[in-house]
Interface confidence: low
């Protein structure tokens, strides 16, 4: 399977909400022994390998934001910790999973990574990630709503397996 990032760049005004999205592509094993660990974290643009560093999003680490479920099941984080920080991650039946960030500030600007780990018999079998940039703007040049820029087809299905 692969992870696609429909949009590589999100440009949003301060105070707006944004939903960053990734999509699981390709055949997904629905066996009872297979689950998917999906999560989000921040990383650094200047890395040798994009998304290799896992930094918190608003002080929430990737395990705080993770979803753990089978195949294309739906799930979402509803715990108070994420909601207190204006965050919610979610996954639907179609392989889409997302993180919603509320009341954006300039500090939210940066590189965001989605991570999917396929777990078989409790062992990590396969891991892929996607990356996208969030730019939060303020002042007269800021857009009135979030503007999204589609990934090129090459980028949107970029897969990095460790």
């Amino acid at each position: 399977f692969k992870v696609a990032t429909p949009y590589s760049l999100y440009v949003c005004p301060e105070g707006q909400n944004v939903t960053l999205t990734c999509r699981l592509l390709g055949p997904v094993d629905k066996g009872h022994d297979v689950t998917f660990y999906k999560t989000w974290y921040r990383s650094s643009r200047g890395e040798v390998q994009t998304c290799s560093e896992r930094r918190p999003i608003r002080n929430l680490t990737f395990q705080d934001l993770h979803l753990h479920h089978g195949g294309h099941q739906a799930a979402n984080t509803s715990h108070d910790l994420a909601q207190r920080h204006g965050l919610e991650s979610a996954s639907d039946h179609h392989g889409n999973f997302s993180i919603t960030m509320r009341n954006l500030t300039l500090l939210d600007s940066g590189l965001y990574c989605c991570l999917v780990v396929e777990i078989r018999h409790h062992h990590s079998e396969h891991r892929v990630h996607g990356a996208m940039e969030l730019q939060v703007q303020t002042g007269k040049d800021a857009p009135s709503n979030c503007v999204v820029y589609p990934s090129s087809s090459q980028d949107s299905e970029n897969i990095t397996a460790a």
């Epitope: 040798v48 930094r55 680490t61």
Partner: antibody, heavy 123, light 106 residues
Framework: QVTLKVSGPGILQPSQTLSLTCSFS??????????VSWIRQPSGKGLEWLAH???????RYNPSLKSRLTISKDSSSNQVFLKITSVDTADTATYYC???????????????WGQGTTLTVSS | DVVMTQTPALMSASPGEKVTMTCSAS?????MYWYQQKPRSSPKPWIY???NLASGVPARFSGSGSGTSYSLTISSMEAEDAATYYC?????????FGGGTKLEIK
């Protein structure tokens, strides 16, 4: 409480393979967010990060040494291993393992270190 | 590689004196981490995410900085602060340490 203990051969000859073991207690490397690194320090000098292994078996290596390094783990026996092939006198150092917990309260630093083991490479 | 340069390499301070040591990164990093090491001991975590004190670190210590320039400050030097301090970045592989600043008590 969390403890880490490093064991190794003490002395090796050039071109031999170094095998180090980090035995730990007080935490599980199967726990989401857990990781262990290897760091070394030549006598009287600074620290050099070598490799890191995450709970999900994801691995990171120092690129300058990557061809000689292999990090692995046995979560069930609470051990992390490091192999360095073709050692030379430049590999003479104290080797440490350290835990890195990507947790909410104490994110992203080595919070517990092993006591270190000294390796001397000499012919 | 991100090269971490610590200055000064060696410094001494009298009890009660304010101490500042710096760590300069060859390219911008998001956060800085500091460790304290005393002779014949393993390093101890001291400051993480640039300005947060690790457990048990006295409040006279502080950390600050951004981009390529970071610093560790002791507001009032005490004898137990004599040690070598290392900075480290987790921004890009290899996750490099600085060469250390050795702080002595006068």
């Amino acid at each position: 409480q969390v403890t880490l203990k490093v064991s190794g051969p003490g002395i090796l000859q050039p071109s031999q393979t170094l095998s180090l073991t980090c035995s730990f207690s007080g935490f599980s490397l199967s726990t989401s967010g857990m990781g262990v690194s290897w760091i070394r320090q030549p006598s009287g000098k600074g620290l050099e990060w070598l490799a890191h292994i995450y709970w999900d078996d994801d691995k990171r290596y120092n690129p300058s040494l990557k061809s000689r390094l292999t990090i692995s783990k046995d979560s069930s026996s609470n051990q992390v291993f490091l192999k360095i092939t073709s050692v030379d006198t430049a590999d003479t150092a104290t080797y440490y393992c350290a835990r890195r917990l990507d947790g909410y309260n104490d994110p992203y630093y080595f919070d517990y270190w092993g006591q270190g083991t000294t390796l001397t490479v000499s012919s | 590689d991100v090269v971490m340069t610590q200055t000064p390499a060696l410094m001494s301070a009298s009890p009660g004196e304010k101490v500042t040591m710096t760590c300069s990164a060859s390219s911008s990093v998001s956060y800085m981490y500091w460790y304290q090491q005393k002779p014949r001991s393993s390093p101890k975590p001291w400051i993480y995410l640039t300005s947060n004190l690790a457990s048990g670190v006295p409040a006279r210590f502080s950390g600050s900085g951004s981009g390529t320039s970071y610093s560790l400050t002791i507001s009032s030097m005490e004898a137990e602060d004599a040690a070598t301090y290392y900075c480290q970045q987790w921004n890009s592989n290899p996750y490099t340490f600085g060469g250390g600043t050795k702080l002595e008590i006068k």
